[in-house]
């Protein structure tokens, strides 16, 4: 069964700056990744970035840099200034659309006890939804 993992890290240098990393553990080819915050995409969450493996990347504030890390994982840096900046308990979600598995989404937030610059290892987050 495919899994999606989500890792959220607060940057030591900028305490209101976050890095979100997401990955897809499955055999299919990824056709789209959507990163949102405040809940799952389409369920109250606000889209931060949409990444297509070949067409390109679209991102919106406070997202500063979305990029592919590997063929099955992405990262997103969030700028921590202004009214729309994230806080420590913000939930971030990543939805991977892949063929032939369908869509798989998982969410994560900053570990409660984490120090700036540290984070839990990127273990699979609970899968919230699988749309086949």
């Amino acid at each position: 069964t495919p899994e999606v993992w989500v890792q959220v890290r607060m940057e030591a240098t900028e305490l209101s700056s976050f890095t979100i990393r997401c990955g897809f553990l499955g055999s299919g080819s990824i056709s789209l990744v959507t990163v949102s915050w405040g809940g799952p995409n389409g369920a109250g969450g606000t889209t931060l970035a949409v990444l297509h493996p070949e067409r390109g990347i679209r991102q919106w504030a406070p997202a500063r840099q979305a990029r592919w890390e590997t063929q099955s994982s992405i990262s997103l840096i969030l700028e921590g200034s202004g009214a729309s900046s994230p806080c420590a308990n913000t939930t971030f979600c990543c939805k991977f659309a892949s063929f032939p598995e369908g869509s798989w989404e998982a969410c994560g937030s900053l570990p409660p006890s984490s120090d700036p610059g540290l984070s839990a290892p990127p273990t699979p987050a609970p899968i919230l939804r699988a749309d086949l």
């Epitope: 959507t34 949409v50 390109g56």
Partner: antibody, heavy 114, light 113 residues
Amino acid sequence: EVQLVQSGAEVKKPGSSVKVSCKASGGTFSSFSIEWVRQAPGQGLEWMGEILPGSNSTNYNEKFKGRVTFTADESTSTAYMELSSLRSEDTAVYYCSSYWFAYWGQGTLVTVSS
Amino acid sequence: DIVMTQSPDSLAVSLGERATINCKSSQSLLNSGNQKNYLAWYQQKPGQPPKLLIYGASTRESGVPDRFSGSGSGTDFTLTISSLQAEDVAVYYCQNAHSYPPTFGQGTKLEIK
């Protein structure tokens, strides 16, 4: 198949504003950004910016910041581009586009002339 | 901003012959993470909006004839029409899809010789 249908041609006076609409059908309007691109007569393509209808999040080309506003109405699946303080060099065909420029509207000619 | 420069500005090719258009970007369009080049090619005929031909430097958009092909990596890219047809007369644009703002080349006008 996504279809984008734009509003008709406009003739405007210098200093005024124009608002161009782009109605989408056949796809999920809120999932992908609506891009705006303009093309002056005989010239190339110039990206103006984009709006993500689901959240009204926007990105603007620095060249147009302060003069252009993107809005979207999810209830009618329509995106809007408003350009203010028009000058003669804004005479161009304005296009909306979606899904990484895979789908395009037919274009709206805006003529700025006194 | 990434500057896209196409060559030549115009090109005349006989029907059935090969047409080649080059595009050079001022910065690399290669995403090192997934080894994909974020470059697209468009065809525009008079009075019509641009039509997406190629994305990811080499992937044909659905419905595009296989005589159109894209190649290249990093900063140097090529659009090739293997056997020119009358309906291919148009202006062709390359586009940076790698970073904001998306920027287009100045265009290459393709005509029949």
